[in-house]
Every structure is written in C-alpha cells, then in structure tokens.
Interface confidence: medium
Amino acid sequence: LQDLCSNCPAGTFCDNNRSQICSPCPPNSFSSAGGQRTCDICRQCKGVFKTRKECSSTSNAECDCISGYHCLGAECSMCEQDCKQGQELTKKGCKDCCFGTFNDQKRGICRPWTNCSLDGKSVLVNGTKERDVVCGPSPADLSPGASSATPPAPAREPGHSPQ
C-alpha cells in the first residue's frame, strides 16, 4: 500500500478513504512533493502582506510586504516598516539620525560619516543625515587659494538633530 502512495505526484494526496487513490489537492491547498497523505493549506497574503506569487496545487503562495514596509524572516514571514532616508527604525519608531551619522536607505541603521582625515584627505562635501561626506584630495595636494573644497561645517554638539 505504501508503494501506491509513493506514486501520487505533487499536487495530489494519497486518499486513505478511497483505497490509496491519488486525489487532487482541494482548492486553496497544495502538495509540493509526491507521496503526501495530506495537502497543506495555502498561505494567505492579507493586510500588510501582498501576494507575490499565487498558490498553485504544487506550490505555496509567496508574499511580499505592501508599500511602506519591507520583508524580514524566512519567506517574508514578517513586515517591518520603512523609515525615510536620514532616519533609522528604533523600537519606538522612526528617529532622525544623530549628528555625524547618516542613512541613505529606507531601512537599516544610521552609520557614522567617513572620517576623511584618517586617509589623509579633506572633506570635499559635508555629510548630511541622508548622505555620507565626500572626501577630496589631501590638504597638502591643494595649492594655496585653489581649494574648491567646501569649508567644514561649524562645530556642533553631538546629539539628535531636530526632528
């Protein structure tokens, strides 16, 4: 009898109530491998989830997150909210990047600006909450009076920039 069940292809299940006949999976269910005794219920992509791939008799539905959210976890099991560029998601919601840090994406964390002086370079373009600084040639490479580099921003106390 076990051999009969192993002949049931994906998209069917081995129906014990009908002498091990291979029966098609009912609507909204699937079996992705052969020899299954039951079909699995299709995943439903509702609310913050949207359907990326419809369920078929042989494969489960695949979900994405709606606009304003991004997927986390295996097979997009969770949706995490996006933030704006220049922000990071904290446990209490989206917060602006602290001065001296930036985030150029809608997800992830604020990262420190590049320290140009570590490479012996000067700041060509100041950093913002959304963009890293742009490093230019070293100060020694610039002839006097020929510098096109933006002067460094006035010193500010570290801390959160205004919301």
């Epitope: 998601l89 446990k91 209490k92 604020c110």
Partner: nanobody, 124 residues
C-alpha cells in the same frame, strides 16, 4: 545552528493570562540581549519588550507596560513573557528575537535571529 523556538501561545479570553517561552540554542545565550516582537493580523511588526544579557534591565512598549513581564533563565537558555490582563488588541504572532545590541528601549532593531513565532489569540 542558531535557533529560537517559541511556545505557549493559544486562545485566551480577555482579561486572561498566558506565559510564552523561547528556547534558545546554538549561541551563548547569556551574552545577548533578547526581545519579544509581535505582528498583529494585517499590521507591521511591533516591539513588545527587551531584556539585557544579565536580566537586570528590562524595557517595555507603552502598550504592554504594567501587564507584561519579560524574564530569562540563563541556566536554561530560555526567555519568557508573562502576559496578564490580555486584551483583544494583544492578538498577534509573537516572535522571540536575539539582539546584537544592548537592548535598550530606544535602540534600533539590531536583530540577527528570529524565531518562527507563536500565535496568541485573545477573544471571547
């Protein structure tokens, strides 16, 4: 392999209680802050609570403060969430999460491992 396995979810009436557990394996549990995060039907993720590596400091979302208690037993590699005075709005899938940061209540989500989740339904 790093794994987190939640248990303890179920159907409970409003005002009732549940205790969620999260069994951790594959990493030195006592070195990491841990969190509980939930996703209500049709909603995005919501942070619920965090606890530091030693268990000395705990943090809660305003929506659960005074009703939920997070704790951990480092000798058993287990995280807990005691949920009292449950409300319909607490209905969600609850995920256990391993953090890479110190786990304060305003730190970013520095989660590198998630559990599979356990479903809590609060309904009469």
């Amino acid at each position: 392999e790093v794994q987190l396995l939640e248990s303890g979810g179920g159907l409970v009436q409003p005002g009732g209680s549940l205790r969620l557990s999260c069994a951790a394996s594959g990493f030195t549990f006592s070195n990491y802050a841990m969190s509980w995060v939930r996703q209500a039907p049709g909603k995005g993720l919501e942070w619920v609570s965090s606890i530091d590596a030693s268990g000395g400091d705990t943090y809660y979302a305003d929506s659960v403060k005074g009703r939920f208690t997070i704790s951990r037993d480092n000798s058993k590699n287990t995280l807990y969430l005691q949920m009292n005075s449950l409300r319909a709005e607490d209905t969600a899938v609850y995920y256990c999460a391993k953090e890479g940061s110190h786990g304060t209540d305003d730190s970013h989500y520095d989660v590198d491992v998630w559990g599979q989740g356990t479903t809590v339904t609060v309904s009469s």
